[in-house]
């Protein structure tokens, strides 16, 4: 009686279980009653990452420099190329098909987490006691200057965008 299901790494064709091709190889001929499945390795810039019965290998992803992409990991016959973004840019999606410029944190905000090739800058508002007076993708919130440690007094209070202004103590 012909099989209705096959073992792992096999496929059913013409009422027969044939071996799948190993990762990195494509199918050129199905098995028959007398012959095994025939496979062939994928060519350069091609891959198949699973046990398969594909008659064509997939093309490696192209990391288009015009989209800000570069190769992070070169593909093999069993793996796709992994793209990442050029310095100062990050991927717009998990598939990393294009890049956008890292966001800068506005004055009053500091960098909580510096951007990577796959994630954008994370900003946080500067809490009381801290400030940021620049728009930056790298600068954290800086603590206000401590006037006391310089034997000075606060002449102008700090904000989330400005440092305190220190001045000499009034002499009586």
């Amino acid at each position: 009686e012909p099989p209705t299901a096959c073992r792992e790494k096999q496929y059913l064709i013409n009422s027969q279980c044939c071996s799948l091709c190993q990762p990195g190889q494509k199918l050129v001929s199905d098995c028959t009653e007398f012959t095994e499945t025939e496979c062939l390795p994928c060519g350069e810039s091609e891959f198949l990452d699973t046990w398969n019965r594909e008659t064509h290998c997939h093309q490696h992803k192209y990391c288009d420099p015009n989209l800000g992409l570069r190769v992070q990991q070169k593909g093999t016959s069993e793996t796709d190329t992994i793209c990442t973004c050029e310095e100062g840019w990050h991927c717009t999606s998990e598939a990393c098909e294009s890049c956008v410029l890292h966001r800068s944190c506005s004055p009053g905000f500091g960098v909580k987490q510096i951007a990577t090739g796959v994630s954008d800058t994370i900003c946080e508002p500067c809490p009381v006691g801290f400030f940021s007076n620049v728009s930056s993708a790298f600068e954290k919130c800086h603590p206000w200057t401590s006037c006391e440690t310089k034997d000075l007094v606060v002449q102008q209070a700090g904000t989330n965008k400005t440092d305190v202004v220190c001045g000499p103590q009034d002499r009586l």
Partner: antibody
């Protein structure tokens, strides 16, 4: 025993189509694929293409637009057609049996004696 | 396409001596999943078709004398004839059977010194 025999005209005019037949015995074309290879006089070997036992074909990209390989299993024959020939296509044309060794490994284990085709007006 | 380059183009060796032919591929012929190298060697005597000697770099075809051996990995391969016999005079071709289009080296002519 395994035998392969190429046949066809020895002289073809430029711009015409070269047509060759490979007749095999001692094995079945449903069990083994068949390659065509050529060798210009005094030069090296160039792979033209293959018809796999399942009937799929693969061609050399340098010839793909001009080449067709087909088979008639009942007659144990494989044909090669190469269109728009020029003097550069003058060569000994061989057919060779494909052998599959598992793990995606293929080689040409039996060859015909070859037939010389000259392209000239 | 994978380009195959053989060296030397011709070689003269004394009877009984060792003959070595080299073959280089433009890309690796090592399949990372199964760790096999897809390289074959053929022998062509004058007026005859090529004859398969070796496949998968080092596996001798049935009936091939054991004085013929193959080695190498990745992009660099060698055919060695351990003790040259008169009947070994021929042109030797390496061929990658990694993927289509299958490609051959330009050939190495082996003669007796």
């Amino acid at each position: 025993q395994v035998q392969l025999q190429e046949s066809g005209p020895g002289l073809v005019k430029p711009s015409e189509t070269l047509s060759l037949t490979c007749t095999v015995s001692g094995f079945s074309l449903t069990t083994y694929g068949l390659h065509w290879i050529r060798q210009p006089p005094g030069k090296g070997l160039e792979w033209i293409g293959v018809i796999w036992r399942g009937g799929n074909t693969d061609y050399n990209p340098s010839l793909k637009s001009r080449v067709t390989i087909s088979k008639d299993t009942s007659k144990n024959q494989v044909s090669l057609k190469l269109s728009s020939v020029t003097a550069a296509d003058t060569a000994v044309y061989y057919c060779a049996k494909n052998s599959y060794y598992g793990d995606g490994g293929h080689a040409m284990d039996y060859w015909g004696q070859g037939t010389l085709v000259t392209v000239s007006s | 396409d994978i380009v195959m380059t053989q060296s030397p183009d011709s070689l003269a060796v004394s009877l009984g001596e060792r003959a070595t032919i080299n073959c280089k591929s433009s890309q690796s012929l090592l399949h990372s999943f199964n760790q096999k190298n897809y390289l074959a060697w053929y022998q062509q005597k004058p007026g005859q078709p090529p004859k398969l000697l070796i496949y998968f770099t080092s596996t001798r075809e049935s009936g091939v004398p054991d004085r013929f051996s193959g080695s190498g990995s990745g992009t660099d391969f060698t055919l060695t004839i351990s003790s040259l016999q008169a009947e070994d005079v021929a042109v030797y071709y390496c061929q990658q059977h990694y993927t289509t289009p299958f490609t051959f080296g330009q050939g190495t002519k082996l003669e007796i010194k």
